[in-house]
């Protein structure tokens, strides 16, 4: 199809080489078409028509994304050629940064419902650059945490080194939806709730004498509880003796509950005590079996191919530790009688 009639938007993604970050493009179709596809209507309160166009189709997947190769080759369907780019409804997610993401991206409706729709498309020219500005050492992260129940703020990474007075007007989106009243480089949240978690996008316009473009950054926000003040609990084993059959294989499980920590370095390991000797056992990797906002339960097993007489004289000790402290639970094996 002919893309010369597409509306054009220029975007800049400046990524930090120090951190993983994502990027998104929205399919900003011109009015009234976009409303029938993406529910991304941008009407100001004064422009709302009598019959709201976003009452149209509720199928949010009926747009097609293409990339325009720089060598003039035909348009390429994003889904077929770019595994690190994911289409989610009307949003294109770039999972990894890199200058190779630079290029022209085109979106248009899949279903052509009227002659006007043929020209209904948007071309987004994306320029991707690594961040070179060393003067801003403490720019905001692309991953930010908000403490539930307290006051918090979400900062726009590309503007976090500017004062509020210097900052241009920012447009914020949460999960692809416009947060129309938030216009500064920082959203202040009076009290943090679960729903504040999500993907935030901040946009502002930059221009030179020739043209203007949108500078965009994406922030993943998670809502968290305060760091635990407790050392981990061992949930299993509970008993300090375990009846076993000699010559049979045996698996002993250690399950421990770790409270939430922002910097989480849990330790869970098995070691064996035999008279005055003790040594750590190489056992299968620990695995998380349940994770909630407040805590995580981690399990690690010790496997004996067959229980020997010598094992009955040993103590098998599970050791768990977090930044607060450690807990141990020892198990003595006892031969089953009759």
């Amino acid at each position: 199809f002919n893309i010369s009639g597409c509306s054009t938007k220029k975007l800049l993604w400046t990524y930090s080489t120090r951190s993983e970050e994502e990027f998104v493009l929205f399919c900003d179709l011109p009015e009234p078409q976009k409303s029938h596809f993406c529910h991304r209507n941008r009407l100001s309160p004064k422009q709302v028509p009598e019959h709201l166009p976003f009452m149209g189709s509720n199928d949010l997947s009926d747009v097609q994304w293409y990339q325009q190769p720089s060598n003039g080759d035909p348009l390429e369907d994003i889904r077929k050629s770019y595994p690190h780019i994911i289409q989610d409804k009307c949003t294109l997610h770039f999972l990894t940064p890199g200058v190779n993401n630079s290029g022209s991206y085109i979106c248009r409706p899949k279903m052509i419902k009227s002659p006007y729709d043929v020209a209904c498309c948007v071309k987004m020219i994306l320029e991707v650059k690594p961040q070179t500005n060393a003067s801003c050492e403490y720019s905001a992260s692309h991953k930010q945490d908000l403490l539930l129940g307290s006051t918090g703020s979400i900062s726009c990474p590309s503007l976090s080194c500017q004062s509020d007075a210097q900052s241009p007007a920012v447009t914020w989106y949460k999960n692809g939806k416009l947060l129309s009243v938030e216009r500064s480089n920082r959203i202040v949240v009076d009290e943090v709730y679960d729903y504040h978690q999500g993907t935030y996008v901040c946009d502002y316009t930059q221009s030179d004498t020739v043209s203007s473009w949108t500078v965009r950054a994406v922030v993943q926000v998670r809502t968290i509880v305060g760091d635990t003040k407790l050392k981990p609990d061992i949930l299993d084993p509970v008993e300090d003796t375990l009846e076993v059959e000699l010559g049979k294989p045996l698996t002993i499980s250690c399950k421990a509950r770790f409270g939430f920590e922002r910097v989480f370095n849990p330790v869970i390991k098995w070691y064996i005590k035999d008279s005055d000797l003790e040594w750590e056992v190489s056992v299968p990797e620990a695995k998380s079996i349940k994770s909630t906002l407040k805590d995580e339960i981690i399990e690690r097993n010790i496997i004996l191919e067959k229980v020997t007489q010598r094992d009955l004289r040993r103590k098998f000790v599970c050791f768990v530790q977090n930044s607060i402290g450690n807990t141990t639970q020892s198990v003595q094996l006892k031969e089953k009688r009759g």
Epitope: H39, R40, V48, Y195
Partner: antibody, heavy 125, light 110 residues
Framework: QEQLVESGGGLVKPEGSLTLTCTAS?????????ICWVRQAPGKGLEWIAC????????IYCATWAKGRFTISKTSSTTVTLQMTSLTAADTATYFC?????????????????WGPGTLVTVSS | DIVMTQTPASVSEPVGGTVTIKCQAS??????LSWYQQKPGQPPKLLIY???ILASGVPSQFKGSGSGTDFTLTISDLECADAATYYC????????????FGGGTEVVVK
């Protein structure tokens, strides 16, 4: 024709539980909408309970007084439920389901543009 | 939670008269306020959204104004059909997690 219909109301004993269901027809839930529950005690005003973001992301707004006893959930592309526990006589009311229209915004800047007829919940021994 | 305070609780005016209902929010909700009309035995009906925009099919005798924390609904050229209870509602939940209603104003048309 776009419609919301509430079901599940009835007589329940104090300290009992009840689950109300809101069923949509003529439209399906999408990221343009929040689906909400509002109640009205006999002869009293409207009291907002909770809203859930209809796209399935799990975002929920809930009145402070309702937290812990009332749980809103999206159960399909056309149904939302309200689970109510530890009910008392003060919970006797008509419970309405409504659609909050967000358009391309995050919040329901276009108001609650569609309402069900309501279902009566009576808490009495 | 945000608190919406509506005044007066009740008002009585003759046919052809004008009624003014005020609504105050406990924090700024910008222009994100709706007004509803409810008649006995019926669910509420949306009249106005974004403080001043008439919902589809609502006659121009209803007028909404205000922003921030103070809002007004004016009903002019009162008709018998306008006898109902009117409610305001905050539609800005991001900062408060709340879509609270005002206490309601009963309008009696004499």
């Amino acid at each position: 024709q776009e419609q919301l219909v509430e079901s599940g109301g009835g007589l329940v004993k104090p300290e009992g539980s009840l689950t109300l269901t809101c069923t949509a027809s003529g439209f399906s839930f999408s990221s343009s909408y929040w689906i909400c529950w509002v109640r009205q005690a006999p002869g009293k005003g409207l009291e907002w309970i909770a809203c859930i973001y209809a796209d399935g992301s799990g975002s929920i707004y809930c009145a402070t007084w309702a937290k812990g006893r009332f749980t809103i959930s999206k159960t399909s592309s056309t149904t939302v439920t309200l689970q109510m526990t530890s009910l008392t006589a003060a919970d006797t009311a008509t419970y309405f389901c409504s659609r909050g229209n967000a358009g391309s915004y995050w919040d329901i800047y276009y108001g609650m543009d569609l309402w069900g007829p309501g279902t009566l919940v009576t808490v009495s021994s | 939670d945000i608190v919406m305070t509506q005044t007066p609780a009740s008002v009585s005016e003759p046919v052809g008269g004008t009624v003014t209902i005020k609504c105050q929010a406990s924090q700024s909700i910008y222009s994100y306020l709706s007004w509803y009309q409810q008649k006995p035995g019926q669910p509420p009906k949306l009249l106005i959204y974004q403080a001043s925009i008439l919902a589809s099919g609502v006659p121009s005798q209803f007028k909404g104004s205000g922003s921030g924390t103070d809002f007004t609904l004016t009903i002019s050229d009162l008709e018998c059909a306008d006898a109902a209870t009117y409610y305001c509602q905050s539609n800005y939940g991001f900062s408060s997690g709340s879509y609270a209603f005002g206490g309601g104003t009963e309008v009696v048309v004499k």
